[in-house]
């Protein structure tokens, strides 16, 4: 058993049918010695008397808010949460496995640039009684500071018969140099509590590996005289690291017909313009990627050919 | 703002070209190592990230773009220990900081070159003959060093008398390639920046 925060304790349990559970001793936080009684949650049933209460915690029915009283007055509370271990592995019931980029990916993170700011998100089908707390650091032994905000519900989607909820959090490395070469990864730790269940999730990454630029901005077409060709031009996204001659992007320009089956023409360039043939009813899209370190491509920025 | 489309300085251009070749070569070599050594801890998540140039060169600090010198987090360990003359930039443009920067890059390349050559000698002794260093990568390191044209004492190749541990050597190769790829990215960024300045 360990303390998550004041008066909230996590009991770690091996979880299988007829498991013996854990013996827990609760102590009433009071100078009083006599006439103390204990109750669980909203029940008025007296579980025991005395300054300490010994309980065998086997299942969620044994968890909850234990309260000690004297003469109708509440003396103190202890909230017991359970952390399940099934076949030697901590449970991951609360969050959905996003399976991208690999199985057992519960937290996904992205950065728009090298400033040390990043966003992480996760998914759940649970709608109520859910709290998250996020901590982060650079490295684990002798950790350097990363400050994270509060996790917020950022999207709701209908998935078949169920609703899926997306939560996200923004974090900022306290002293980040965009040009630095990372040797220690960022660690992100999320504590999740649903009703009386505790779980924790972690992710470890280098900012350089989670870079995903915003789409190029000001995408424009300029028809070339007496030709089906157009000059496409665009600019670096505002959120990208500067100077751009140091933090350079490379671009992919795509001409896509109305039908998904039509052949796509693609051009790759380091410049912020390209000449392409504009077909009727087609659209031109441009996306960006770090020129020197192949992390994710941005989403597409698009304009119609007409 | 957009990348400048000014004509590259002829003095700088060969270095930019060589640095792009270097990044391509080290990325290819790293990919080959990851595939060949698939049952070894060779991915970014599995290896310890070591920098053999740590405390010996200061490329990131010496080559910091002017715009980032206002960022205090970038100035933690700014050292000014290399004063030499480089030929990558036309001499009229060679400022003190550029010389420090290019000299630091040269020292990095020299250190990695020695490490890679020593390692290759060990890998050639491996009866499994599982992996060797790509000669193209070694040649590209050499070409960039020549383009930088710094005078520096030659570092003798380390020779070892004891029997090599091939498992450890292959893991060390992975560590080295990951670190060198990161440094090659920095070198490419620097050359691109200097080329545009």
């Amino acid at each position: 058993i360990w303390e998550l925060k004041k008066d909230v304790y996590v009991v770690e349990l091996d979880w299988y049918p007829d498991a013996p559970g854990e013996m827990v001793v609760l102590t009433c936080d009071t100078p009083e010695e006599d006439g103390i009684t204990w109750t669980l949650d909203q029940s008025s049933e007296v579980l025991g008397s005395g300054k300490t209460l010994t309980i065998q915690v086997k299942e969620f029915g044994d968890a909850g808010q234990y309260t000690c009283h004297k003469g109708g007055e509440v003396l103190s509370h202890s909230l017991l949460l359970l952390h399940k271990k099934e076949d030697g592995i901590w449970s991951t019931d609360i969050l959905k496995d996003q399976k991208e980029p690999k199985n057992k990916t519960f937290l996904r993170c992205e950065a728009k640039n090298y400033s040390g700011r990043f966003t992480c998100w996760w998914l759940t089908t649970i709608s109520t009684d859910l709290t998250f707390s996020v901590k982060s650091s650079r490295g684990s032994s002798d950790p350097q500071g990363v400050t994270c905000g509060a996790a917020t519900l950022s999207a709701e989607r209908v998935r078949g018969d169920n609703k899926e909820y997306e939560y996200s959090v923004e974090c900022q490395e306290d002293s980040a140099c965009p040009a630095a070469e990372e040797s220690l990864p960022i660690e992100v730790m999320v504590d999740a509590v649903h009703k009386l269940k505790y779980e924790n999730y972690t992710s470890s990454f280098f900012i350089r590996d989670i870079i995903k630029p915003d789409p190029p901005k000001n995408l424009q077409l300029k028809p070339l005289k007496n030709s089906r060709q157009v000059e496409v031009s665009w600019e670096y996204p505002d959120t990208w690291s500067t100077p751009h001659s140091y933090f350079s992007l490379t671009f992919c320009v795509q001409v896509q017909g109305k039908s998904k089956r039509e052949k796509k023409d693609r051009v790759f360039t380091d410049k912020t313009s390209a000449t392409v043939i504009c077909r009727k009813n087609a659209s031109i899209s441009v996306r960006a990627q770090d020129r020197y370190y192949s992390s994710s491509w941005s989403e597409w920025a698009s304009v119609p050919c007409s | 703002r957009n990348l400048p489309v000014a004509t590259p300085d002829p003095g700088m251009f060969p270095c930019l070209h060589h640095s792009q070749n270097l990044l391509r070569a080290v990325s290819n070599m790293l990919q080959k190592a990851r595939q060949t050594l698939e049952f070894y801890p060779c991915t970014s998540e599995e290896i310890d990230h070591e920098d053999i140039t740590k405390d010996k060169t200061s490329t990131v600090e010496a080559c910091l773009p002017l715009e980032l010198t206002k960022n205090e987090s970038c100035l933690n360990s700014r050292e000014t220990s290399f004063i030499t003359n480089g030929s990558c930039l036309a001499s009229r443009k060679t400022s003190f900081m550029m010389a420090l920067c290019l000299s630091s890059i040269y020292e990095d390349l020299k250190m990695y070159q020695v490490e890679f050559k020593t390692m290759n000698a060990k890998l050639l002794m491996d009866p499994k003959r599982q992996i060797f260093l790509d000669q193209n990568m070694l040649a590209v390191i050499d070409e960039l060093m020549q383009a930088l044209n710094f005078n520096s004492e030659t570092v003798p190749q380390k020779s070892s008398l004891e029997e090599p541990d091939f498992y450890k050597t292959k893991i060390k190769l992975c560590i080295l390639l990951h670190a060198f790829r990161i440094r090659a990215v920095t070198i490419d960024r620097v050359m691109s920046y200097l080329n545009a300045s």
Epitope: D41, Q42, F60, G61, K84, I126, D129, N162 | -
Partner: nanobody, 124 residues
């Protein structure tokens, strides 16, 4: 709209059996734990039995252990309560309830969705 609909209640003699059913709709309950609670006239709603999401783990109130069996059909989104050797103290309105998140609880306050209830009367 999420709905839990109980059925199978009725008037029986002491010693008889009844099988209660609960049909769940409006969401997939395959990841939820399900439970049965009962409320006798003038008393608090109390825990009877519950089953986790996979059907592997079950829990019972002391007074019904060995007599009642809870089970579920995940495909059909159904939960059942087989009640044997009924006694007059088993009389009350039986409610089906669901809780998100795989594991069952004994406290009624932890359940997210409730049915309207079905009356069970056991006469002596």
């Amino acid at each position: 709209e999420v709905q839990l609909v109980e059925s199978g209640g009725g008037l029986v003699q002491a010693g008889d059996s009844l099988r209660l059913s609960c049909a769940a709709s409006g969401r997939s309950f395959s990841n939820d734990a399900m439970g049965w609670f009962r409320q006798a006239p003038g008393k608090e709603r109390s825990f009877v039995a519950a089953i986790n999401w996979s059907g592997e783990l079950t829990g019972y109130a002391g007074s019904v252990k060995g007599r009642f069996t809870i089970s579920r059909d995940g495909v059909e989104n159904m939960v059942f309560l087989q009640m044997n050797s009924l006694v007059p103290e088993d009389t009350g309105v039986y409610y089906c309830a669901a809780v998100e998140g795989r594991d069952y609880y004994r406290g009624a306050q932890y359940y997210d969705y409730w049915g309207q209830g079905t009356q069970v009367t056991v006469s002596s």
